[in-house]
């Protein structure tokens, strides 16, 4: 509440994240031009990434384009791509929707249709949809332990949200434990009225606000956080602003003296953990 | 303005960005003695990071050292590194500006030069000047989508740049399209008074700054971003205190049982997303 | 100090680390069967990651998992996880401690154990204790260049921590030159009252707060910053709530067709930069 | 000049083997996809095989499960293995490359072509 006679000082805040689950991936796997079912288990090391304090990201869903190299391949026949001859391939040209520079020539991309030949990573990523439903789906049973240390320097006051007193085997409920800092992540987004099983298939960005409202004076002395979840990213987002959530990342290797590299596209959620708050005191 | 009756309340932000182009990179290769023009493609995945939240790094330059290996190998001749006799070579000593640890030994680096023989990351990197012009200075053309959610908890307020209306093809212009939030990078230079050729033969860090100054009073509601642009780094810094922006990293390998890496001292430019302001409220 | 007629305004900030040092590890190593004592070099791209703004992370220790490759392999024999019949394993069941997930067999993990057979990266992480002392225990010595950027954009002013006077081969201390950016992370640690060789091999958080305190008022004006260290993690934290500061990353690699990955679980230091303050004009 | 130069062929039983090989040379950029045609007395030029610079391989139905191509970029060059010959495999082969002659310069470069004959 808000004391008009006390010096309010807003906070300073450092956050630790901790990630726990396994997933079970099962995906068709082609080789050799044959198709099989693949069966793949992904841990921490395998779906979240080394991030800096205020933001962890969770993988649930992936594009792989394996076995690139650079050279030249008949670009993706996206909408609008196609060609019939030469004079529609411009060379040096790069459209922004494709992933390489024209080289000038209209070339086969299968037996039906020719598009623009490119110098790029080939073949080039097609453009297809995040699988349905989300390969890492069971993500939603991941939990997630927050770390919180605050300060209010004016105040000389630290604290943080974990207490000597708490129990490392706790999961946060709203009603029953709203002190716990390991969250479900599944129960993450069902406070945000959110619907995880969905989000997971293209990515999305979910905010934890860790709100503290300190009351310093020691005669009525209260300093713990409150919880709250909402999502950041818009989900009525149109195509062109890229809805979801997703990135590309790139592993390199070389293999008959050429360098190659798998290409993920990504799609996960990203977590933003927002602190915020005061501490007043006399 | 300024409306002192109001209740002010600093902005709870979230931003997502996204990255898009690509570069052509034309560059002198060196393989088995002989030297050829080497050509590659780079998109997304190969010159940007996954970064979480506030920052975004586009590299626009690089330096390579391929094929280090763990062992021994006389340091890098620069100004003051030489010696003549193994006097001058300390064992166990680490030169804040060498790349390993000295053995005592006074070692040929090429006809002419005798440095310290060191243990380290072999042959060392050698100390030569960032590419000049950038080898990814094409990066001008890329754009970059901004996407920000903000907050405003105690006015229990949440809106976002991107709305409905927009149109996902614009690009940013001060006077033009003032509320477009896909920018190009050559764009936030010129409005910087920055020159984008220059900065990114050495890296920089530009930030982006996004003010809101919102008054959520319902009979005279406004709560849209202004955008402006300013250098962020020191562009006249002295030598020792490491201008530009650069950060080196390493790709591993194997080859013949010996591990190997390929390190890339990568330069570019690291942007800066700065969400201020306040709402108000009577 | 506080002058209530001014018009306060918080501190907008950008940061920019550098760190320096080399690391010279001895552990052993078996290959073949035969244990011998390794001896490597760790520069920058080796131990610390490249990372955005307010944090940076440097690598003091860490255990290594090779050659792991997705298989069925009997699950690491922690306390309560051996069984003596399949009636103990569950098939499909994952343990939140375990890495894999069970296929409901009991099977010999050695000579004297059995535990749950599981689906996993195998062979499964050992959970062994991190190396004692740390394996980059020298990381003391480390210097960490720190590059701060401020702004008040209501009084239109600017200004960074580093003045064109200062000598890029200073060490900060706190009484004799408290201006210098330039700081050694054992003094660091030291400044506040920790111990670096005993948190390197845990890992753990360390902030670095930088308070500007501006008065701009033309005839009175000071606005320079002041730096302190506090360590953010709780040293006295709960085995069941993390302590310390690791995370696990993994370098992907094929091997006779088959991709397997080698597992590094990294402890370290990271360090938040926190900067706060205020701008004060008439 | 830019050359393909086709070496392996000649007369074979059928069940018998041959490998074909096609190297590159003069002065270019890089060396893309690189395929084997055939042609038949009296028919029209059809792919055996073709593989990309990253080794990815496409074959003829014919061809499927007998023939392998294979390359070395080292050398700039294609090989086919021919495994399995049969009678209906007599033809001219002929290497196909398409080469970058500099940066986004690409020509369909033909080798002479090599004969292959294989008796019952």
């Known amino acids: 509440s808000d004391k008009l006679y006390q010096r309010k000082e807003p906070v300073i805040s450092s956050v630790h994240t901790k990630v726990k689950g396994i997933a079970e991936v099962t995906e068709n796997v082609t080789e050799g031009g044959v198709t099989k079912l693949g069966h793949s288990i992904f841990d921490t090391a395998d779906y979240t990434f080394p991030l800096q304090g205020n933001s962890f990201f969770v993988m649930t869903n992936y594009v792989k384009s394996e076995g690139q190299v650079q050279t030249l391949c008949p670009e993706y026949p996206r909408r609008g791509a196609q060609c019939s001859s030469d004079r529609r391939c411009k060379k040096g040209w790069m459209d922004p929707q494709s992933k390489g520079i024209q080289t000038g020539r209209c070339v086969p991309y299968d037996k039906t249709r020719k598009t623009c030949e490119v110098s790029a990573w080939c073949p080039t990523e097609e453009e297809k949809e995040a699988p349905r439903p989300a390969l890492l789906r069971s993500a939603e049973n991941f939990t997630v332990l927050i770390k919180n240390n605050i300060h209010f320097p004016g105040h000389n006051y630290t604290t943080r949200n974990i207490l000597p007193t708490m129990n490392g085997s706790c999961t946060f409920h709203k009603t029953w434990d709203p002190q716990c800092s390991i969250f479900r992540l599944g129960d993450i987004f069902q406070e945000a009225g959110e619907n995880f099983t969905e989000v997971a298939v293209q990515g999305g960005i979910m905010g934890i606000e860790i709100y503290w409202d300190c009351n310093l004076d020691s005669w009525s002395h209260h300093c713990r956080p409150r919880y709250s979840f909402r999502r950041l990213d818009d989900k009525n987002m149109d195509e062109s602003f890229v809805p979801g959530y997703n990135f590309r990342y790139a592993k390199y290797y070389k293999e008959n003296n050429v360098e190659k590299r798998t290409l993920i596209k990504a799609f996960g959620i990203r977590f933003d953990i927002l602190v915020f708050g005061t501490g007043g005191k006399f | 303005s300024d409306k002192l009756y109001q209740r002010k309340e600093p902005v709870i932000s979230s931003v997502h960005t996204k990255v898009k182009g690509i570069a052509e990179v034309t560059e002198n290769v060196t393989e088995g003695g002989v030297t050829k023009l080497g050509h590659s493609i780079f998109d997304t995945a190969d010159y940007t990071f996954p970064l979480q939240g506030n920052s975004f790094f586009v590299m626009t330059n690089y330096v390579k050292s391929e094929g280090q290996v763990q062992t021994l190998c006389p340091e890098y001749p620069r100004r003051g590194a030489q010696c003549s006799s193994d006097r001058r070579c300390k064992k166990g000593w680490m030169d804040p500006q060498s790349k390993g640890i000295q053995t005592g030994r006074c070692v040929p680096y090429d006809k002419t030069r005798k440095t310290c023989e060191v243990s380290a990351w072999c042959p060392t990197e050698e100390e030569k000047e960032a590419p000049r012009p950038a080898l990814l200075r094409s990066a001008e053309n890329f754009t970059v989508l901004i996407k920000n959610n903000i907050h405003f908890p105690g006015h229990n307020y949440t809106t976002r740049n991107i709305l409905p209306t927009m149109n996902g093809s614009c690009t940013f212009h001060k006077t033009w399209d003032p509320q477009c939030s896909i920018f190009r990078l050559g764009d936030i230079f010129q409005e910087a008074g920055e020159n984008f050729t220059e900065v990114a033969v050495q890296g920089g860090i530009m930030g982006i700054e996004i003010y809101w100054d919102c008054n959520l009073d319902s009979w005279s509601h406004h709560c849209r971003p202004r955008y402006s642009f300013r250098r962020l780094d020191d562009k006249n810094m002295d030598e020792s205190f490491v201008p530009g922006y650069n950060f080196r990293y390493a790709k591993y390998y194997k080859e013949n049982n010996v591990e190997k890496r390929t390190l890339i001292k990568a330069f570019g430019i690291r942007f800066d997303i700065l969400v201020f302001g306040t709402g108000g409220k009577f | 100090s506080d002058k209530l007629y001014q018009r306060k305004e918080p501190v907008i900030s950008s940061v920019h680390t550098k760190v320096k040092g080399i690391a010279e590890v001895t552990e052993n190593v078996t290959e073949g069967g035969v244990t011998k004592l390794g001896h490597s070099i760790f520069d920058t791209a080796d131990y610390t990651f490249p990372l955005q703004g307010n944090s940076f992370f440097v690598m003091t220790n860490y255990v290594k998992s090779e050659g792991q490759v997705q298989t069925l392999c009997p699950e690491y024999p922690r306390r309560g996880a051996q069984c003596s019949s399949d009636r103990r394993c569950k098939k499909g069941w994952m343990d939140p401690q375990s890495k894999g997930i069970q296929t409901g067999r009991c099977v010999p993990y050695d000579k004297t154990r059995k535990t749950c057979e599981v689906s996993a990266w195998c062979p499964t992480e050992e959970e062994k204790e991190a190396p004692r002392p740390a394996l980059l225990r020298s990381a003391e010595n480390f210097t960490v260049l720190i590059k701060n950027n401020i702004h008040f954009p209501g009084h239109n002013y600017t200004t960074r921590n580093i003045l064109p006077t200062m000598n890029g081969s200073c060490t900060f201390h706190k009484t004799w030159d408290p201006q210098c950016s330039i700081f050694r992370l054992g003094d660091i640690f030291q400044e506040a009252g920790e111990n670096f060789t005993e948190v390197a091999v845990q890992g753990g958080i360390m902030g670095i707060e930088i308070y500007w305190d501006c008065n701009l008022d033309s005839w009175s004006h000071h606005c320079r910053p002041r730096y302190s260290f506090r360590r953010l993690d709780d040293k006295n934290m709960d085995e069941s709530f993390v302590p310390g500061y690791n995370f696990r990353y993994a370098k992907y690699y094929k091997e006779n067709n088959v991709e397997k990955r080698t597992l590094i679980k990294a402890f370290g230091i990271r360090f938040d930069i926190l900067v706060f303050g205020t701008g004060g004009k008439f | 000049a830019v050359q393909l130069v086709e070496s392996g062929g000649g007369l074979v039983q059928a069940g018998g083997s041959l490998r074909l090989s096609c190297a590159a040379s003069g002065n270019f950029f890089r060396v893309n996809t690189m395929a084997w045609y055939r042609q038949a007395p009296g028919k029209q030029r059809e792919l055996v095989a073709d593989?990309?610079?990253?080794?990815?391989?496409n074959y003829a139905d014919t061809v499927n499960g007998r023939f392998t191509i294979s390359r070395d970029n080292v050398r700039n060059t294609v090989y086919l293995q021919m495994n399995g010959l049969r009678p209906e495999d007599t033809a001219a082969y002929y290497c196909?490359?398409?080469?970058?002659?500099?940066?986004?310069?690409?020509?369909?470069?033909w080798g002479q072509g090599t004969q292959v004959t294989v008796s019952s």
């Open positions: 593989i990309t610079r990253g080794d990815r391989t």
């Open positions: 196909y490359a398409v080469i970058e002659l500099g940066v986004l310069e690409p020509r369909d470069y």
